[in-house]
Interface confidence: low
Amino acid sequence: GELETSDVVTVVLGQDAKLPCFYRGDSGEQVGQVAWARVDAGEGAQELALLHSKYGLHVSPAYEGRVEQPPPPRNPLDGSVLLRNAVQADEGEYECRVSTFPAGSFQARLRLRVLVPPLPSLNPGPALEEGQGLTLAASCTAEGSPAPSVTWDTEVKGTTSSRSFKHSRSAAVTSEFHLVPSRSMNGQPLTCVVSHPGLLQDQRITHILHVSFLAEASVRGLEDQNLWHIGREGAMLKCLSEGQPPPSYNWTRLDGPLPSGVRVDGDTLGFPPLTTEHSGIYVCHVSNEFSSRDSQVTVDVLDPQEDSGKQVDLVSAS
């Protein structure tokens, strides 16, 4: 007869490992007992369990509650066992020794490989600000056995670098993603992708990029100067900018205090019916935690009567 087993049995951490050992004997042969032992190099053999044809399963105290026979129906020539809830420490060489009658003893070895799926973690880098050079956006670390693969999935242009640290039973891989921050990256996803033979599918952790910036400020509302005449109602100036974090706005007048009746509403400066006292230089100050910007405009409120008077003069002069 002969023993049938596997060279390597691979399980994921926490799964049950079936250690196969089947005696394919001639007609009339019987299996008296099957002894399982762990036989790592240089450490001798340690009994795991013994399946006895008469007395049943005996389990070593070190493996109490963790070694079982496969569920019935069972073939009397099948000496396979289940090692419950495999852990990293179970990884190694195992030997199955079958005592048969009348053919004698047979033995075979297999290697148990325990895959430890990684538990990836993503750590954002320092705050990103427009104008910085190459900056760490995020690092992603995954530890497992064997070493996991760590890559990045993103539309953002950047560079990656990886390093790995070997531990006694696992390896930790860290990949860093560096980029040159720009405002166009705001809200863009940066996804760490971890691959490993112990995972049914890649694990993905997504980090949303936040880049601090503040755009140049400009003021809208003076496009048609002729609209800024005495008596006009609803005149307003609007300050235009954008930023991350969203900026706050402040209005001042360069040549004095804001005239009475002028309303400040965030980015908008609202005027009451215009008078000449509304003429002046107005400054919009935009700021966020990243930076600040100013934009100033000159308001010149026209007096239609003055204009028409000049026109009459011009006509009479001709």
Epitope: A62, Q88, L119, F165, H167, R169
Partner: nanobody
Framework: EVQLVESGGGLVQPGGSLRLSCAAS????????MGWYRQAPGKQREYVAT???????NYADSVRGRFTISRDNSKNTLYLQMNSLRAEDTAVYYC????????????WGRGTLVTVSS
Amino acid sequence: EVQLVESGGGLVQPGGSLRLSCAASRSTFSLNIMGWYRQAPGKQREYVATITTGGSTNYADSVRGRFTISRDNSKNTLYLQMNSLRAEDTAVYYCTAELVRRGPTTYWGRGTLVTVSS
């Protein structure tokens, strides 16, 4: 045999902080994974966090970002820093450790009570 003794539990207001400790009776270098579980009154024991000898950590979603697990192998001690505590964090917190040897064995402490209440 490894004895695990937790300490640091007590009464704390919502939003407050506590630091739990777990002292092991033998070198924690041989304990490949140490961690914390908790059991609220009338509920099943639930996973909180674990840490490997190399310092890699994992957290339950319910505590990620609020709790931090750490270990000092030179002092044979495991820690759990708990910030921004909520009423639902009230539970008995148990320390656990897995011994690296041929037949892996998991050890448990007796637990320490954390009560979050105003």
